[in-house]
Interface confidence: low
């Protein structure tokens, strides 16, 4: 799997899990949240060869005719594949409220 | 939706589906399908700013990093959301046999 | 495709209540983080800020209205309704809603706005 | 209340005009200043957030700077299609519209 514990051992240029953390208020703008002050949220990024953890059998078509069509601006793009939530406190007046937002943190990646 | 009634009726340099004809024999080098010669697969390509068609809460937040940060290599990407498959004609020796090959034609896109 | 659209009377009469319907499509007040707005344009003049209410209920109101103001939203029909008591000639103007993500304050897409004059 | 001062109130200029137009806040707001265009009978669009972010799908000779009390709205070279009004917002303590500057045809 492209997830942290093959992508962050490895130097690979290929599509693999990539480290990102985000300070809500400076990176985003948003104030309101209270805990925490930002969290990991990696990303996907790197070449999809063919074959290379290929979600569909779209993508592999997509990246074998990209091979052999090396010009064209069709080609399979690196994204995320697994995902998990993220807790947060916030306050509405001075009533703290928490809640789980969903799919905020990339765990793994795919080619698709 | 960002499907072929959207994205084929209107220029959008954003995440939309784009037309892709695949002949199986001259883009992929495959010689077995009999029919069909080839098929519209499609693809998906473009900009992913953001809230346009994002598919996560991670995606959203990422779409807002990048346009606060734009120098930064983290932004999402233009790929397949729906799928449909491709049923073809191929021979084992003189038999005919007919197939459903899974996940072959991109119908709509997303940005992910 | 994100759309709001603004519904209600077109002409009110003083001390009456102002009730306006805000009905949208392309995203859902259930998001998290999610928020709709209210803004008012009298005829010729500037924007004002009225109220705001947002996918957790939390609600805010303008300073110098808060006492004429209650937002709701009904997250089912992708509607949120405003309502403004005691109405006056100098609250005419066009009312339009908007959509607002994540807290962040700005508003990134508009209704088409609804004017609404007060007069006997 | 934060109060939001805009200047001019308006201004004439010429199309291929650099054109400056600046909001000041009461009190600090950090970068929490978002610019709107507003044309007659239309809906304002947002076209910059968070004091420098352009709004996706508007063109580069809009651009925003400033942070804390003083910012500026800058259109590089001004279109025919830029003549407008003008609005700058602050989001740091609930929300406050500028009153407006009006670009007009000189």
């Known amino acids: 799997a492209l997830d942290a514990a093959y992508c962050f051992r490895n130097v690979q240029d290929n599509c693999c899990l990539r480290p990102l953390y985000i300070d809500f208020k400076r990176d985003l703008g948003w104030k309101w949240i209270h805990e925490p002050k930002g969290y990991n949220a990696n990303f996907c990024a790197g070449a999809c060869p063919y074959l290379w953890s290929s979600d569909t059998q779209h993508t592999k078509v997509l990246s074998l005719y990209n091979t052999i069509n090396p010009e064209a601006s069709a080609s399979p793009c690196c994204v995320s594949q697994d995902l998990e939530p993220l807790t947060i406190l916030y306050y509405i007046g001075n009533t703290p409220k928490i809640e789980q937002l969903s799919n905020m943190i990339v765990k793994s990646c795919k080619c698709s | 939706a960002l499907d072929a009634a959207y994205c084929f009726r209107n220029v959008q340099d954003n995440c939309c589906l784009r037309p892709l004809y695949i002949d199986f024999k001259r883009d992929l080098g495959w010689k077995w399908i009999h029919e069909p010669k080839g098929y519209n697969a499609n693809f998906c390509a473009g900009a992913c700013p953001y809230l346009w068609s994002s598919d996560t809460q991670h995606t959203k937040v990422l779409s807002l990093y990048n346009t606060i940060n734009p120098e930064a290599s983290a932004s999402p990407c233009c790929v397949s959301q729906d799928l449909e498959p491709l049923t073809i004609l191929y021979y084992i020796g003189n038999t005919p046999k007919i197939e459903q090959l899974s996940n072959m034609i991109v119908k709509s896109c997303k940005c992910s | 495709q994100v759309t709001l659209r603004e519904s209600g009377p077109a002409l009110v009469k003083p001390t009456q209540t102002l009730t306006l319907t805000c009905t949208f499509s392309?995203?859902?007040?259930?998001?998290?983080?999610?928020?709709v707005g209210w803004i008012r344009q009298p005829p010729g003049k500037a924007l004002e800020w009225l109220a705001h209410i947002y996918w957790n209920d939390d609600k805010s109101y303008s300073t110098s209205l808060k006492t004429r103001l209650t937002i709701s939203k009904d997250t089912s029909k992708n509607q949120v309704v405003l309502t403004m008591t005691n109405m006056d000639p100098v609250d005419t103007a066009t009312y339009y809603c908007a959509r607002d993500f994540y807290y962040s304050g700005y508003f990134d897409s508009w209704g088409q706005g609804t004017l609404v004059t007060v007069s006997s | 209340d934060i109060q939001m001062t805009q200047s001019p109130s308006s201004l004439s200029a010429s199309v291929g005009d650099r054109v400056t137009i600046t909001c000041r806040a009461s009190q600090d707001i950090s970068n929490y200043l978002n610019w709107y265009q507003q044309k007659p009978g239309k809906a304002p669009k947002l076209l910059i957030f968070g004091a420098s972010s352009l709004q996706s799908g508007v063109p580069s000779r809009f651009s925003g700077s400033g942070s804390g009390t003083d910012f500026t709205l800058t259109i590089s070279s001004l279109q025919p299609e830029d003549f407008a009004t003008y609005y700058c917002?602050?989001?740091?303590?609930?929300?406050?519209f500028g009153q407006g500057t009006k670009v007009e045809i000189k």
């Open positions: 917002q602050q989001t740091n303590t609930m929300n406050t």
């Open positions: 392309g995203f859902s007040l259930s998001t998290s983080g999610m928020g």
